[in-house]
Amino acid sequence: PGPPPGPPRVSPDPRAELDSTVLLTRSLLADTRQLAAQLRDKFPADGDHNLDSLPTLAMSAGALGALQLPGVLTRLRADLLSYLRHVQWLRRAGGSSLKTLEPELGTLQARLDRLLRRLQLLMSRLALPQPPPDPPAPPLAPPSSAWGGIRAAHAILGGLHLTLDWAVRGLLLLKTRL
């Protein structure tokens, strides 16, 4: 006879899982806010900057009430994957000017990656349907100039900040419904 069966595996409390996701998201939000401020100090932005390849903001604050957990987590994961890809691109192709944002940009990338893994874990713990594998994204074109890289950095960090701010609010609201 094989070894006696172990105790039944208790699924962790989903609220505790969500809590740790909120903490990671809030921490990344503060890091992003600070890094965006650092970028503005080094390379002041002349107005708002956009990048067509970035995801559009998932939700206005007013529409938070209608959110459902599977939709929020799936959308958040997809958006953060896009931002991770953009941060990686920025570090690789952003030019020598943006080297002054290291090691902070590298830390941001690592924390973004960690948050994505946490979201994946949360989705499996909540037995949510796993999204299909991401189709290969077209490669991002290198910035046309050093200033193009700086403008892209403003757009990426600004968009990530808005996305994470939305995510914290959304996750906290969803926690009350679990």
Epitope: D19, V22, L23, L24, R26, S27, L29, A30, R33, Q34, A36, A37, Q38, R40, D41, K42, P44, L172
Partner: antibody, heavy 120, light 108 residues
Amino acid sequence: EVQLVESGGGLVQPGGSLRLSCAASGFTFSSYGMHWVRQAPGKGLEWVAYITPGSNTIYYADTVKGRFTISRDNAKNSLYLQMNSLRAEDTAVYYCAREYYSYDEGFAYWGQGTLVTVSS
Amino acid sequence: EIVLTQSPATLSLSPGERATLSCSVSDLIPSQYLHWYQQKPGQAPRLLIYRTSNLASGIPARFSGSGSGTDFTLTISSLEPEDFAVYYCQQGVDVPFTFGQGTKLEIK
């Protein structure tokens, strides 16, 4: 040794203006974010405003937004708080404070404070 | 905004006793953004503990901090006469940065 010395406080009438200064020494002023924090008589601490080293990002408490302006002159190692449309509830000791080594390590160094009294 | 609530409002203890001060946060915050300050009458506040549990420069080892999520604690293992003061917690994760209302530690 890090030193922060505030000045410019005093008695002002409601609706009036005042400009506070904070002279910094003992550290590379241009490398640190700076804050103003206030304390009404017998009350607790209230954060007022923050400015990044290069002055390109500024945050304010809702209670002072639109009335107070934080600024700095790195060449003069000085931090300022321009206070307009003053109200009785702005009466407080105003402290300038420097972040520790990183933005997320709290307010490590404080001045001795300057008292602002708003009264008719 | 994130609201910090400190308890008790006043704590009356004798020198040599252990003091436990609490700070409850309205929202979950990462522990690296929670700090503690000490203020004596007529003086500016002084940073005691940063990032929940790190002692600031020159702070004696009888002070310690702990906690996570929404509940944080400042502990003074054995009170010295100079420890009687007002203590504030503060969060730095979200703008506006906010302080607790303070706990007054007084001699019994």
